[in-house]
């Protein structure tokens, strides 16, 4: 038994040593964030294992003082979602003694209304502002220097509208050192970790965006006032443009910000000649006035892949050839949708055939495909020698996208006998539950019943087959109960079965001469019982006329009368 | 002298769970089934299932199969019942009974032993 | 399951008085079981297999019954008879007792 494993919180981390009683949990929050709830859970020992405290959550909090910050980031509440009205949040940067502060926007974007973001040079409300988004339209690309070590943060929202917010990344550097540079989505490489003069860095995107504005490669410059000689670039999901790299990935404009409206983006991607396209579509959120469209080619003349509009869940794409051509249509008219809408599609390299890679034998067991070529439709059938099983799916199909509808499955030791099943008017006892080599089942009849065949079954293994049980599963009768007497067969009549005794169930039949007929039931049965009885009086044949009854009645002068019969069993 | 010999009375928390025992003397440990019947107000006596000492088999009423969980130590003549994620309606008396295979009765009783859950 | 429905569920008697207590069953069962139990006691068999008395069962008891209805009968109630009798049944898995019928001396 054991602890459930803690939710991850959202914008942060947790790190288990063990889910078993003693084992504990450690939650971390992503930069920016403030964990709210205990950071150490333990498990504790129970009937069931329970964590002794509710799992943490990550929250953006509005305003705090950071004292010796060095790097991280501060976002306003409910960030990337919208932050709430009537917010007034201060943070205070502090860099450590002897270092100043440096400021880069990921994201600014308030609600037009009076909602308003002020960073000061300075530790108070008081100090000087360096940014006022009243003042500035536009963001500093190059981001904010602090004189000393200080930066105090304003955001003020008012009573409507609301937006993403924002989120600001800190740097603290040292005296003769530039600030460590950032780009969003993207990475850098630097020569030096503390970057002091002479530090080259090496900025590049992280797959599908595309650097612009400024330099791939920067220097910090000026011993006596040390800073980057050119302005950091930026990534940006771009609207078309020619990739020729053997994978990569597509991003919607702008990507995860919202795509703008009316625009018309073509993207080509070139692989090796032999080879064609797998497009792995793994978000696909756009309008329904949108139109995504991949073309099987290297123009918008090839034979369509695929037209979609509006969102749809993860799929996949292959192209015959090397080329495919991808085309985005936003709606001018519309207006855009919100974070992280749009489309997001790696791609990959594959091998150019038209069947589905092949498949391997299988310990244990065997495979039969349909047809030798492997084309789209083919099945491949897997079994198991005896003794075996298959252990997931036995039957796999080429699709159309050429590749197998199932994993591979395994064939496994079957180290068990089925279930034996229940028995009518029995219980049964089980020694093992799953019926492994060596249970045995039981069966004992209810009251009243009686068992034919074996009462105790067990499960022995085999040199070549699957384990078995040593007999087959009982029965249990209902109670031999004592048999009804035989009846005379009516006079002019007949009966079958003529017997002395009829068991418990049986039915006995009666019939007439010809010239008579039956008075009474033609059918009548022992009913079981203590004691088993005849379930009706036996009948009569009586004369279908007059005429008939006088001739059989002098045929009978000299014969005694019937015995009267009993209708109960012999005891 | 056939005697069942159970286990003295038990306060247990709900959600806790319970293991009583029934020491059988005066006959053959593995001849007979040990079988457990609940006693309470509410619903009379009922049938929580039975265990073949000399193979482990067991079989449950239904109602109680998960609840309850019969096991024996052959070694010394002792069988067992566990009751789980207790509740105050499990409160009751508990007895073991023996029985045989073709007896359909419970021929001889322990003295039963008191479960109270309670918090 | 067969639920079984004893009448009546308490009687009383006066010593020397004949006694008859029954147990009817939902559906048809081969043979029914009794026992006596005392307050603060366990119960012990009494009748088993619808008729046949368990050991040291005084001869005043008997049992009877056939399908869906039998009954316990005391030729002359004493007072150590007072106690609740319970049938139960095992024609059907699982086994079932009746309510038990509870009888005091007058």
């Known amino acids: 038994l054991s602890c459930h494993f803690p939710r991850r919180p959202a914008y942060g981390d947790v790190t288990v040593t063990s889910l078993h009683p003693g084992g504990s949990a450690r939650f971390h929050c992503a930069t920016g964030y403030q964990l709210k709830g205990a950071r150490h859970l333990t498990c504790l020992n129970a009937t069931q294992p329970f964590w002794d405290s509710k799992e943490p959550v990550c929250i953006a909090a509005c305003g705090g003082v950071i004292r010796n910050a060095t790097t991280g980031r501060i976002v306003s509440p409910g960030f990337p979602g919208n932050y709430s009205n009537n917010l007034t949040c201060h943070w205070l940067l502090e860099a450590p003694e002897g270092q100043r502060l440096h400021l880069h926007f990921e994201k600014v974007s308030l609600a037009e209304d009076d909602d308003r973001l002020i960073i000061r040079n300075g530790d108070n409300v008081e100090a000087p502002p360096v940014y006022d988004s009243y003042e500035v339209e536009y963001l500093p690309i190059e981001g904010l220097l602090s004189s000393g070590k200080h930066f105090f943060v304003e955001l003020s929202t008012d009573s409507s509208g609301a937006a993403a917010g924002m989120a600001l990344r800190y740097e603290a550097f040292q005296q003769g050192h530039c600030y460590e540079p950032f780009v969003k989505y993207g990475n850098f490489s630097s020569s030096t970790p503390t970057y002091p003069v002479g530090t080259t860095v090496e900025f590049s995107c992280d797959p599908g965006y595309t650097l612009e504005q400024g330099s791939i490669i920067i220097e910090c410059v000026d011993p006596h006032d040390p800073q980057w000689n050119e302005t950091e670039p930026a990534c940006r999901a771009v609207c078309s443009g020619e990739i020729t790299d053997s994978a990569g990935v597509v991003l919607s404009p702008n990507w995860p910000e919202p795509y703008g409206r009316g625009q018309d983006c073509i993207w080509g991607v070139h692989v090796e000649e032999d080879k064609r396209i797998m497009l792995d579509i793994r978000v696909l959120r756009i309008g329904p006035g949108d139109v995504l469209t991949f073309y099987d080619g290297d123009d918008l003349t090839a034979r369509v892949l695929g037209q979609y509009s509006g969102p749809r869940s993860h799929f996949k794409l292959f192209t015959s050839m090397a080329d495919v051509t991808i085309q985005f249509q936003s709606d001018p008219g519309t207006s855009v949708l919100g974070y992280q809408q749009g489309f997001v599609i790696h791609f990959f390299e594959v091998p150019r055939n038209d069947t589905c890679p092949e498949l391997p034998e299988i310990p244990n067991g065997w495979k039969s495909p349909s047809q030798p070529e492997l084309v789209h439709g083919t099945v491949v059938t897997y079994q198991c020698y005896p003794g075996y099983q298959v252990v997931g799916s036995s039957v796999l199909m080429c699709q159309w996208d050429l590749t197998w509808s199932e994993d591979l499955p395994s064939c496994q030791r079957v180290t068990s006998c089925h279930d034996p099943g229940d028995v009518e008017h029995s219980r049964r006892l089980i020694s093992s539950p799953k019926f492994p080599v060596g249970a045995t089942v039981q069966y004992i009849c209810d009251q009243g019943f009686v068992l034919m065949g074996s009462s105790i079954l067990t499960c022995h293994d085999r040199q070549a087959g699957s384990p078995k049980w040593s007999d087959r599963a009982p029965k249990c009768l209902l109670e031999q109960l004592k048999p009804c007497h035989g009846l005379s067969a009516p006079e002019n009549g007949a009966r079958s079965p003529e017997k002395q005794l009829h068991p418990a169930g049986a039915t006995i039949h009666f019939s007439c001469a010809p010239g008579y007929v039956l008075k009474g039931q033609a059918s009548i049965k022992c009913v079981p019982g203590h004691p088993s009885h005849w379930s009706d009086p036996p009948p009569i044949c009586r004369a279908a006329s007059l005429d008939g009854f006088y001739n059989s009645r002098s045929l009978d002068v000299a014969k005694a009368p019937a015995a009267s019969s009993t209708l109960d069993a012999a005891h | 002298e056939v005697q069942l010999q159970q286990s003295g009375p038990e306060l247990v928390k709900p959600g806790a769970s319970v293991k009583i025992s029934c020491k059988a003397s005066?006959?053959?440990?593995?001849?007979?089934?040990m079988r457990w019947v609940k006693q309470s107000p509410e619903k009379s006596l009922e049938w929580i299932g039975e265990i073949n000492p000399s193979t482990g088999g067991t079989t449950y009423n239904q109602n109680f199969k998960a609840k309850a969980t019969l096991t024996v130590d052959k070694s010394s003549s002792t069988a067992y019942m566990q009751l789980k994620s207790l509740t105050s309606e499990d409160s009751a008396v508990y007895y073991c009974?023996?029985?045989?295979?073709?007896?359909?009765?419970?021929?001889?009783w322990g003295q039963g032993t008191t479960l109270t859950v309670s918090s | 399951q067969i639920v079984l429905t004893q009448s009546p569920a308490i009687m009383s008697a006066s010593p020397g008085e004949k006694v008859s207590m029954t147990c009817s069953a939902s559906s048809s069962v081969s043979y029914m079981h009794w026992y006596q139990q005392k307050s603060g006691t366990s119960p012990k068999r009494w009748i088993y297999?619808?008729?046949k008395l368990a050991s040291g069962v005084p001869a005043r008891f008997s049992g009877s019954g056939s399908g869906s209805s039998y009954s316990l009968t005391i030729s002359s109630m004493e007072a150590e008879d007072a106690a609740t009798y319970y049938c139960q049944q095992w024609s059907s898995t699982p086994p079932t007792f009746g309510g038990g019928t509870k009888l005091e001396i007058k």
């Open positions: 009974a023996r029985g045989g295979y073709f007896l359909y009765y419970f021929d001889y």
């Open positions: 005066g006959y053959s440990f593995t001849d007979y089934y």
């Open positions: 297999d619808t008729s």
